[in-house]
Structure formats: structure tokens, C-alpha cells
């Protein structure tokens, strides 16, 4: 680490379903990119992190009282679905085209 | 600190508009409770932190590779408006009953 944290952004996060114990029911894919929101929410909050008014307020309070209040947090603000092949309760391989909320589409400061 | 962070929850955060430089345009109230989302998003994520599938996946990956991936973050998931009195461009004190997104209503793990 350089010591300077980068600003809030979407980064790759390859997830192997075997690593998290979901390979018992998800047949395919074996892995996917969940992405991750990484980096700091620094003052001034840029438009690209789509800050809420509360995030702006919290950032300003943190600036004034850094030990009392934390910074806003870099989190997923929009998620995307992935397609999965899974075994249904009859053991039949079934395709779910839109398995919602599995991958980060956008990150922001909240 | 006890060393054990509490779980993700809403806590009081009194904000004085003078402290953040907004007293130049917000006349009243002088301060309000913005609330703050504080605490950790620990495995297993409880229902009350309304985790997304992505947050659950990230939590599981963090459990397996704690140095590679961060925990999900405790953030506002629902915001409430406050009422403010401000001076418009004619110098007329004007009430905005619903100044949106200023106060935390609910926290969750994202």
C-alpha cells in the first residue's frame, strides 16, 4: 500500500462458488465477478460517487470532528443480476437468467 | 473501547449547521439529528441489516480471505427528510417541509 487510499470505485472481485460453499446448489458458473466497492469517501465528495445529502453532511462532520464521526462508506449503490444454472428441489438442472443482486453495477458514498 | 465492535445499528448524530458551514443558508433549525450507521457487518448477517445477496457473498468471501476482501459496510439504507427554514433569493424566509435525504431512517449491511 502507498499509504494513500484511492477514492471510492468499483474493482474486480472474482468469487469461486466452491470457496463460499454455494457449489452444492449452483452448478454453473463455477465463478463470477461480483466486483467490490473499494476506496475512501474523501472531501469533497465527487459527483461520480452520487452522494446523498446525508453522506455529504457526514463527510463535513467527519472533517470537523474526525474522531467522533466516521467517513461515509464506499458501497454498491446499484446491483446487477447474473445467470446461474442450479438444481431445483427435484434435482432438475434449471436456468435462472436473472439471479438478482449478485454483482456490483455502481459504487457510491453512503 | 471493549475491542468488540457492536453490530450495525442506527445511532444519534447531532449536527450543528454552523459546524459544517450550512448556517449561511439554513436559518433553522440550528441543529438536527442526522443519525449515523455504526457497527460491524459480521457473519452471519442478520435479517435486521437487510443484506443484499452481494453483501452476503462479500461477507462469505471475507470469512475465507479476510486480508483480500473487506466486510460489507454498515450504511443508511433508508433516509428521511427534515424541515428547514431558508432565505430565498428575495431574502424571504421560506419553509421547505421535506428537505429529503438528511436523516437516517434505517441502516443495513451493503
Amino acid at each position: 500500500s502507498t499509504g494513500a487510499s484511492s477514492h471510492c470505485q468499483k474493482t474486480s472481485l472474482r468469487v469461486n462458488f466452491e470457496d463460499i460453499g454455494w457449489d452444492s446448489w449452483i452448478i454453473a458458473p463455477k465463478e463470477y465477478d461480483a466486483y467490490e466497492c473499494k476506496g475512501g469517501c474523501f472531501f469533497p465528495l465527487a459527483d461520480d460517487v452520487t452522494p446523498t445529502k446525508h453522506a455529504i453532511v457526514q463527510t463535513l462532520v467527519h472533517l470537523k470532528f474526525p474522531t467522533k464521526v466516521g467517513k461515509a462508506c464506499c458501497v454498491p449503490t446499484k446491483l446487477s443480476p447474473i445467470s446461474i444454472l442450479y438444481k431445483d428441489d427435484m434435482g432438475v438442472p434449471t436456468l435462472k437468467y436473472h439471479y438478482e443482486g449478485m454483482s456490483v453495477a455502481e459504487c457510491g458514498c453512503r | 473501547s471493549t475491542g468488540a465492535s457492536s453490530h450495525c445499528q442506527k445511532t444519534s448524530l447531532r449536527v450543528n449547521f454552523e459546524d459544517i458551514g450550512w448556517d449561511s443558508w439554513i436559518i433553522a433549525p440550528k441543529e438536527y439529528d442526522a443519525y449515523e450507521c455504526k457497527g460491524g457487518c459480521f457473519f452471519p448477517l442478520a435479517d435486521d441489516v437487510t443484506p443484499t445477496k452481494h453483501a452476503i457473498v462479500q461477507t462469505l468471501v471475507h470469512l475465507k480471505f479476510p486480508t483480500k476482501v473487506g466486510k460489507a459496510c454498515c450504511v443508511p439504507t433508508k433516509l428521511s427528510p427534515i424541515s428547514i427554514l431558508y432565505k430565498d433569493d428575495m431574502g424571504v424566509p421560506t419553509l421547505k417541509y421535506h428537505y429529503e435525504g438528511m436523516s437516517v431512517a434505517e441502516c443495513g449491511c451493503r
Epitope: - | A28, S83, L85, V92
Partner: antibody, heavy 118, light 111 residues
Amino acid sequence: QVQLVQSGAEVKKPGASVKVSCKASGYTFTRYWMHWVRQAPGQGLEWMGEINPSQGGTNYNEKFKSRVTMTVDKSISTAYMELSRLRSDDTAVYYCAIGSNYGGLVYWGQGTLVTVSS
Amino acid sequence: EIVLTQSPATLSLSPGERATLSCRASESLDNYGISFMNWFQQKPGQAPRFLIYAASNQGSGIPARFSGSGSGTDFTLTISSLQPEDTAVYFCQQSKEVPRTFGGGTKVEIK
């Protein structure tokens, strides 16, 4: 700058009606509520009611509700206050004033003296 | 309706003295953390002038010697150093609810 110019003094007989006008300039007429306040000689201020020029919605003081009518003509940025069935104790200076939804009366007209005498 | 009671009825002070005018409401004028209390100055033969709003904020062009304070039901208008031109009647007004009501006024005289 904001200006509220009211119509001239009136002398009326008891039982008659009076209509006072208030011509606004220097701001967007539909932006603020127009209030009417009266002041009897040597007395305090008495709020009569308010009208929203944008949609014409009104709030009247119960005391005047049966006798007062507030209207606007947006095309000429003018507000009107009509008081009917006049009595001698309606003798007063009538003011128009503007304020926002907060209700503070920021700008005032010069006042119109209405004298009710037989 | 909300009744506003002003005191004293008359205040007679010398130039440079501090004037303290009181206004008491029959119920709280606070809502949303905002005090719906306003003060006006009226000189003889003139329309009222907007002095203080939301209990403690000065209207445009009002000299710094005029200040307001209070919350709930008890409010104060203070003139820190009276000037001869401050001779006037001062009215409080609540804008919390309809009917908007005024206090009976305090007459400030300069000795």
C-alpha cells in the same frame, strides 16, 4: 425592488362593501402568499387572512370569514380584499403584505385608510 | 387561536440603554426545530417593518443592535443600545398556525 402599492383612502357607509387593491411589482407575483392585516386607530395589528396567488387558495381569520373575500388578478399582479356589511368598528388602515409559506410578513404596502361613517 | 401577550405595555428609557421586550405565547411556537415567532417595528404613520424572524434572525437591513431570542412560549426582543430613531411600537407575531396572531404591542419611548 419589491413594491406593494395600495389603492387610495375610502369613506363608506355602514352596511356597504369596500374593495381594496394591492398592486405588486419587483418579484414573481405567484411566488408568495399575500396577507391582509388591519389596524384600527390607536390599536394593534389584526391578521385578516391570506391568499396564495398561484392557485387562489385562501386562509381566513374566523372573525372575518363571513364578510371577507380575497382574490387576485394574476394578469396585472394585483390582489384584492373585499369586506362587506361594513360597521363603524371596521374603520382602520388595511395593509397588504407578502410572506412565504413560513408566514413572516416581509414586505408591506403603504396602507389604505377605510373610514366607515354614517 | 394562539394568544400572544406582550410586556411591558410601555418602556421609557434613555439613549444608549438596553431595552428588553417580552412576548409570551399561549402555546409553544416551536415545530420541526423552528420557532415561528417574528417581531415588527412600527413608527407613527408608517407600515410595520419586518425586524426579526424565527425568533432570532434579523431581517434584511436591520441594525445589529436588534436581536431576538427564546423558544417555546417565551420570546424576547432586545435593543442593545437605544437610539432616538428606535421610538416606535414593537409587535410580536406567530406564524405557526392560522390565524396568524399579533401581540398587543410594546411602545418604546426615549426619555
